[in-house]
């Protein structure tokens, strides 16, 4: 730790005196003190000397000497009083700015320690302090107002009793700022605006803060608008409101509007978009494909997005067939408003039944007219399979009919033994039918295909299996010839098991 000479914590001198403060350390040393200097500073080897040939009250203060090379940052200090009978106070700053609930140091330094007993803090022109002002005094530092409040923003003077009379310091202005948590809070309404040319419109930009010192403005496409500001104070907050009223909007009023507010903590801004249109509009769209395929028994939500101005006058879901004349239950139709001009309408179709395949249409109406959006719903079914034995053109033929959606593929298997289903070990032959004959293929219905397998001789200890599959699943039918010589007998003499 550096050493100061003279080796005293406090030094009292008279005005005009020569004062020399020497600091010595192991390495280089540095003096520091009040920001206002009034000293000559020079180095002398390993010491640093602070000197004045003519001390004045302005030299009153605490001077600290540090050793920059000391990792512990040790320092030594000395407080100098220059006791001037005419100047009991050395005021280091005439304006002090703090935030509410901080301690505010009013830096009036007493120039004579003897005067400490008779000091007091007053407001200018001899006015007493406000009630509940809690303060303390240090001759080295000045008066501290503890946990300063906004209302204590005043001009103060430090008072000392000298020879029975009060001598005042120059005034110190205290500014207590409200603690501003951040930039002002903002609202810009509406969040989005659409108007038909010639209609009226209003945009309101408002900002609020605990402190009155903030600015707010409304700009249109980066141009600041000159709008009269309304100010208010309620709920302990200052409010500033800008209202833009447009009696008859035109296309030049369209664009981006930004509400911007700023204070010492920074800036907040929020934006909205104003669209001006020639006439009413109504647009229907869906993020879904309008052609839907769902497995029977599963559920589906049909969603339609509506963009409209002016607002909708009516809307509904309609089932257009082809199966029944049932209509969607109102409780299954749901509407949500995303914002003023956009809505989402949902039709929930849980556990779909075969009779619910078909066309579903959403219809909406506003002053711009009617619009409709139609979904086509096809149900997917796993294949159902049946096999019969018949003669075609005199040849014994196994006939397999498979019905499902999407269109099933057909594969024939011949395997040894009698079985409900051929497994790999038993398979003797496999035939793929790449082009089965389509028997029926109507919209929203199952597709039925037929595959023929010509068999010269039905082997009696074997099984013939027709397998059909599609993206939903698979189905099969095993045909088991029972009597020998079946190849000569008509199919009704044969037994088969599904």
């Amino acid at each position: 730790i550096p050493v100061i000479e003279p080796s005293v914590p406090e030094l009292v001198v008279k005005p005009g005196a020569t004062v020399t403060l020497r600091c010595v350390g192991n390495g280089s040393v540095e003096w520091d003190g009040p920001p206002s200097p009034h000293w000559t500073l020079y180095s002398d080897g390993s010491s640093s000397i602070l000197s004045t040939n003519n001390a004045t009250f302005q030299n009153t203060g605490t001077y600290r000497c540090t050793e920059p090379g000391d990792p512990l940052g040790g320092s030594a200090a000395i407080h100098l009083y220059v006791k001037d009978p005419a100047r009991p106070w050395n005021v280091l700053a005439q304006e002090v700015v703090v935030f509410e609930d901080q301690d505010a140091l009013l830096p009036c330094l007493l120039t004579d320690p003897v005067l400490e007993a008779g000091v007091s803090l007053v407001r200018v022109r001899g006015r007493p302090l406000m009630r509940h002002t809690n303060y303390s005094f240090s001759p080295w530092h000045g008066f501290t107002i503890h946990r300063a409040k906004f209302i204590q923003s005043q001009d103060y003077q430090c008072s000392a009793l000298m020879g029975g009379r009060k001598v005042m310091s120059i005034s110190i202005r205290l500014k207590v700022q409200k603690v501003i948590p951040g930039p002002p809070a903002l609202t810009l309404v509406p969040a989005e605006l659409v108007r038909i040319r010639g209609e009226a419109a209003q945009i309101v930009c408002s900002a609020s803060s605990v402190d009155v010192n903030f600015d707010v403005f409304l700009q249109h496409n980066n141009t600041k608008l000159a709008i009269p500001q309304q100010s208010d104070f309620h709920n302990n907050r200052y409010q500033k409101v800008l209202t833009l009223n447009l009696d008859q909007v035109d296309f030049q009023h369209a664009g981006n509007y930004s509400c911007v507010a700023s204070n010492v903590q920074g800036k907040h801004s929020t934006s909205m978009f104003f669209r001006v249109v020639e006439s009413a509009y109504l647009n229907l769209s869906s993020e879904q494909n309008l052609i839907q395929e769902v497995t029977v028994g599963e559920g589906l939500n049909l969603k339609v997005m509506v963009e409209a101005y002016p607002g909708l006058q009516g809307f509904n879901w309609t089932y257009l067939g082809p199966f029944s004349d049932h209509q969607p239950e109102p409780k299954l139709a749901n509407a949500t408003t995303k914002d003023t001009y956009r809505h989402t309408f949902t039709l929930s179709l849980p556990r779909l039944k075969p009779s619910e395949a078909g066309r579903y249409s959403f219809l909406a109406r506003n002053p711009g007219g009617w619009r409709a959006l139609t979904f086509e719903l096809t149900l997917r079914y796993p294949p159902e399979v049946s096999v019969i034995w018949t003669f075609i053109n005199g040849s014994g033929t196994l006939l397999c009919a498979a019905s499902g959606y999407p269109q099933p593929n057909v594969t024939w298997l011949q395997c040894s033994g009698h079985t409900d289903r051929c497994d790999e070990a038993q398979v003797l032959q496999v035939w793929d039918d790449p082009y089965p004959e389509v028997l029926s293929q109507e919209p929203f219905h199952k597709v039925t295909v037929q595959s023929l397998l010509t068999v010269e001789t039905l082997e009696h200890n074997q099984t013939y299996e027709c397998r059909a599959h599609n993206s939903v699943g698979s189905g099969s039918w095993a045909f088991i010839p029972i009597s020998a010589g079946a190849h000569t007998h008509p199919p009704d003499e044969f037994l088969f098991t599904p």
Epitope: P35, H38, L41, P68, A93
Partner: antibody, heavy 117, light 110 residues
Framework: EVQLVQSGAEVKKPGESLKISCKGS????????IGWVRQMPGKGLEWMGI????????RYSPSFQGQVTISADISITTAYLQWSSLKASDTAMYYC??????????WGQGTLVTVSS | QSVLTQPPSASGTPGQRVTISCSGS????????VNWYQLLPGTAPKLLIY???QRPSGVPDRFSGSQSGTSASLAISGLQSEDEADYYC???????????FGGGTKLTVL
């Protein structure tokens, strides 16, 4: 070794806010005043204000009072200069410097602030 | 308009001695010490002289300062090309309660 390292150059639009920083190292940050000095393009140096990080005592030049805010965070030995709403006339080089008995003994490298629409 | 007055430019040839003046008033140079700063292009300012005539360590003794009344001057002897820079004088001002600067002098080494 005493060092003051300032944040990088900034380009802003009028009306925007800004906070530039100055990190001190190599000395006892709480025991020395830190000042901010402005140099406008082609002009001289102007003192803006000083802060004593030890107790946040802050003094402003009358020309800059209310225009800027000087603050410090002793936990990260950093001083700050901030504007809530920049103007084109704030375009300048800003220096931080350690202040001692009326002079600035160590300076930061400077932060160039450009304000243009 | 700067509080302290300096000539806008000065010049000299290598090896020569040049002097830069700085004038103020009783509230600054008249009652407080003078400091000088050097600004080399593209670098941070550097303290050259403090307390009228004191040189921080690392500053060559070619640089010297003096003060008399409300004026001060910076002298550079044995001028070198690396001395080409802007030089600013400064002093504490009691009425401002802060430091004031001169307008700066651009030194050219011919």
């Amino acid at each position: 070794e005493v060092q003051l390292v300032q944040s990088g150059a900034e380009v802003k639009k009028p009306g925007e806010s800004l906070k530039i920083s100055c990190k001190g190292s190599g000395y006892s940050f709480t025991n020395y005043w830190i000042g901010w000095v402005r140099q406008m393009p082609g002009k001289g140096l102007e003192w803006m204000g000083i802060i004593y990080p030890g107790d946040s005592d802050t003094r402003y030049s009358p020309s800059f009072q209310g225009q800027v805010t000087i603050s410090a965070d002793i936990s990260i030995t950093t001083a700050y200069l901030q504007w809530s709403s920049l103007k084109a006339s704030d375009t300048a080089m800003y220096y931080c410097a350690r202040h001692r008995l009326g002079f600035f003994d160590y300076w930061g490298q400077g932060t160039l602030v450009t304000v243009s629409s | 308009q700067s509080v302290l007055t300096q000539p806008p430019s000065a010049s000299g040839t290598p090896g020569q001695r040049v002097t830069i003046s700085c004038s103020g008033s009783s509230s600054n140079i008249g009652s407080n010490t003078v400091n000088w700063y050097q600004l080399l292009p593209g670098t941070a300012p550097k303290l050259l002289i403090y307390s009228n005539n004191q040189r921080p360590s690392g500053v060559p003794d070619r640089f010297s300062g003096s003060q008399s009344g409300t004026s001060a001057s910076l002298a550079i002897s044995g001028l070198q090309s690396e001395d080409e820079a802007d030089y600013y004088c400064a002093a504490w001002d009691d009425s401002l309660n802060g430091p004031v600067f001169g307008g700066g002098t651009k030194l050219t080494v011919l």
